[in-house]
C-alpha cells in the first residue's frame, strides 16, 4: 500500500523520494507522475530528470532538494483538493528490469480558517531552504531568508515541515533510499 502524506489547500505539498548516485554527478533519470506507477514510466508525467538536469516539468511541480545528490523529492505548489491522489516516483536505473518505483498517496485537507490579519506567506519563505531553478541550463541555487512576521498557521506549517523533514530522514535511514552502484 502507498505511504500517505498530507497537506492543506493553499500550502505546498512535499513528497519525498531519494536515491544515492553511484558517484557524484553520475545521475539516473527519474520521473514523477500523477497516478500509481505503471510497468514503465510514470503515468501522466509531471516532471522528469535526465542524467544531467531537470528536462521536463509542468507548472506547480518542482524539485527543491539537491537532485544532483539524489534528492528527487517533489514539491507541489499551492495545492488544491484536485491534487489529492497517488503519485509515482520512478528511479530509472539502467539495465534489465532495474527500475525502482514508489507510490505515494497525497491527501489534501481543506484549509483551516484563521482570523489572523497578517498576510499569508508561502511557508518556504519562512523556512530557509535551497531552491533549484527550473531550466535546461546549469541549475542555480539560492537560499531564501526567513521573515519575522509569521502567523500561527505558518508556525503550524513550519512544524509540519520539520516533521516531514524528520520523516524524510527516517525514510532515508530505514532504507527507502536507493543506493546505485
Amino acid at each position: 500500500s502507498e505511504v500517505e502524506y498530507r497537506a492543506e489547500v493553499g500550502q505546498n505539498a512535499y513528497l519525498p523520494c531519494f536515491y544515492t548516485p553511484a558517484a557524484p554527478g553520475n545521475l539516473v533519470p527519474v520521473c514523477w507522475g500523477k497516478g500509481a506507477c505503471p510497468v514503465f514510466e510514470c503515468g501522466n508525467v509531471v516532471l522528469r530528470t535526465d542524467e544531467r538536469d531537470v528536462n521536463y516539468w509542468t507548472s506547480r511541480y518542482w524539485l527543491n532538494g539537491d537532485f544532483r545528490k539524489g534528492d528527487v523529492s517533489l514539491t507541489i505548489e499551492n495545492v488544491t483538493l484536485a491534487d489529492s491522489g497517488i503519485y509515482c516516483c520512478r528511479i530509472q536505473i539502467p539495465g534489465i528490469m532495474n527500475d525502482e518505483k514508489f507510490n505515494l498517496k497525497l491527501v489534501i485537507k481543506p484549509a483551516k480558517v484563521t482570523p489572523a490579519p497578517t498576510r499569508q506567506r508561502d511557508f518556504t519563505a519562512a523556512f530557509p531552504r535551497m531552491l533549484t531553478t527550473r531550466g535546461h541550463g546549469p541549475a542555480e541555487t539560492q537560499t531564501l531568508g526567513s521573515l519575522p512576521d509569521i502567523n500561527l498557521t505558518q508556525i503550524s506549517t513550519l512544524a509540519n515541515e520539520l516533521r516531514d523533514s524528520r520523516l524524510a530522514n527516517d525514510l532515508r535511514d530505514s532504507g527507502a533510499t536507493i543506493r546505485i552502484g
Epitope: 497516478g35 505503471p38 510497468v39 510514470c42 508525467v45 521536463y56 539495465g95 528490469m97 532495474n98
Partner: antibody, heavy 122, light 107 residues
C-alpha cells in the same frame, strides 16, 4: 503515417538463432518505448519484451530473458530482437509495437507491425 | 504475475446488438488496461487505453469502463466489421499480460 515493418522471420532449426528487425517511420522513434509481442498459431497474444527510449533499460518475459535480447538503433529508427537457442514453442508471429511515449499517459500498444512468422522445426 | 481473465471466451450476437465483454485482473491494476480487436490474419488494433479512453479513429460505439480489478468493453450497436477476437491487456505490472481473448461471432 505511423508504420512498423518487421522482417527477419523464417524457418529455423531447434537450437538455432534468428534476428528480427522492425523499421519504424512516421513518428519520432526515440520518443517511445517499443515492444515485441508474439502470437503462436491459433493462440492468444503474449508479451515478449520492451525497451526504453535510448535502450538503456530493457524488460523481458522471465522465461525468455536468458535467450532473447531486445535492442534498438535510434539513428536507424530500428528495433531488434535477437533470439537464441530457439525452441519449437517459440514458433509464432512476432509483432513489433509502439508503446508509451515520453510524457506517459497513453498505456497501450497504439501501433503494430504486420508481424513476421518464426517457425522453429527440424 | 497478474492474471487477466476475460469472459465470455466466445459470444454469438447479431448486428445491432449491444455486447459487453468483461476482463478481471488478479490484482489491482488501477486504470492501466487496454482493449484490442484482432481479425483473422491481421495485427491487433488498439481500441481503448487507460481503461476508458478511446484510441484515435475508433468508432464511438466502443466504450471502456472500470478500474482496479474489473473492466468492461461495450459495443453499443454491433456492426458487421466488429466480428473479431477481443483482448484485454494490463500495463501495470511486469510481465505485461493479456487476457485469453473473446471471440465474437455472428449469430
Amino acid at each position: 503515417e505511423v508504420q512498423l515493418v518487421e522482417s527477419g522471420g523464417g524457418l529455423v532449426q531447434p537450437g538455432g538463432s534468428l534476428r528480427l528487425s522492425c523499421a519504424a517511420s512516421g513518428f519520432t522513434f526515440s520518443d517511445y518505448y517499443m515492444a515485441w509481442v508474439r502470437q503462436a498459431p491459433g493462440k492468444g497474444l503474449e508479451w515478449v519484451a520492451n525497451i526504453n527510449y535510448d535502450g538503456s533499460s530493457t524488460y523481458y518475459l522471465d522465461s525468455l530473458k536468458s535467450r532473447f535480447t531486445i535492442s534498438r538503433d535510434n539513428a536507424k529508427n530500428s528495433l531488434y530482437l535477437q533470439m537464441n537457442s530457439l525452441r519449437a514453442e517459440d514458433t509464432a508471429v512476432y509483432y513489433c509495437a509502439r508503446d508509451v511515449g515520453y510524457y506517459g499517459g497513453n498505456y497501450g500498444f497504439a501501433y503494430w507491425g504486420q508481424g513476421t512468422l518464426v517457425t522453429v522445426s527440424s | 504475475d497478474i492474471q487477466m481473465t476475460q469472459s465470455p471466451s466466445s459470444l454469438s450476437a447479431s448486428v445491432g446488438d449491444r455486447v459487453t465483454i468483461t476482463c478481471r485482473a488478479s490484482d489491482n491494476i488501477y486504470s492501466y488496461l487496454a482493449w484490442y480487436q484482432q481479425k483473422p490474419g491481421k495485427s491487433p488494433q488498439l481500441l481503448v487505453y487507460n481503461a476508458k479512453t478511446l484510441a484515435e479513429g475508433v468508432p464511438s460505439r466502443f466504450s471502456g469502463s472500470g478500474s482496479g480489478t474489473d473492466f468492461t468493453l461495450t459495443i453499443s450497436s454491433l456492426q458487421p466489421e466488429d466480428f473479431a477476437t477481443y483482448y484485454c491487456q494490463q500495463h501495470y505490472g511486469s510481465p505485461l499480460t493479456f487476457g485469453q481473448g473473446t471471440k465474437l461471432e455472428i449469430k
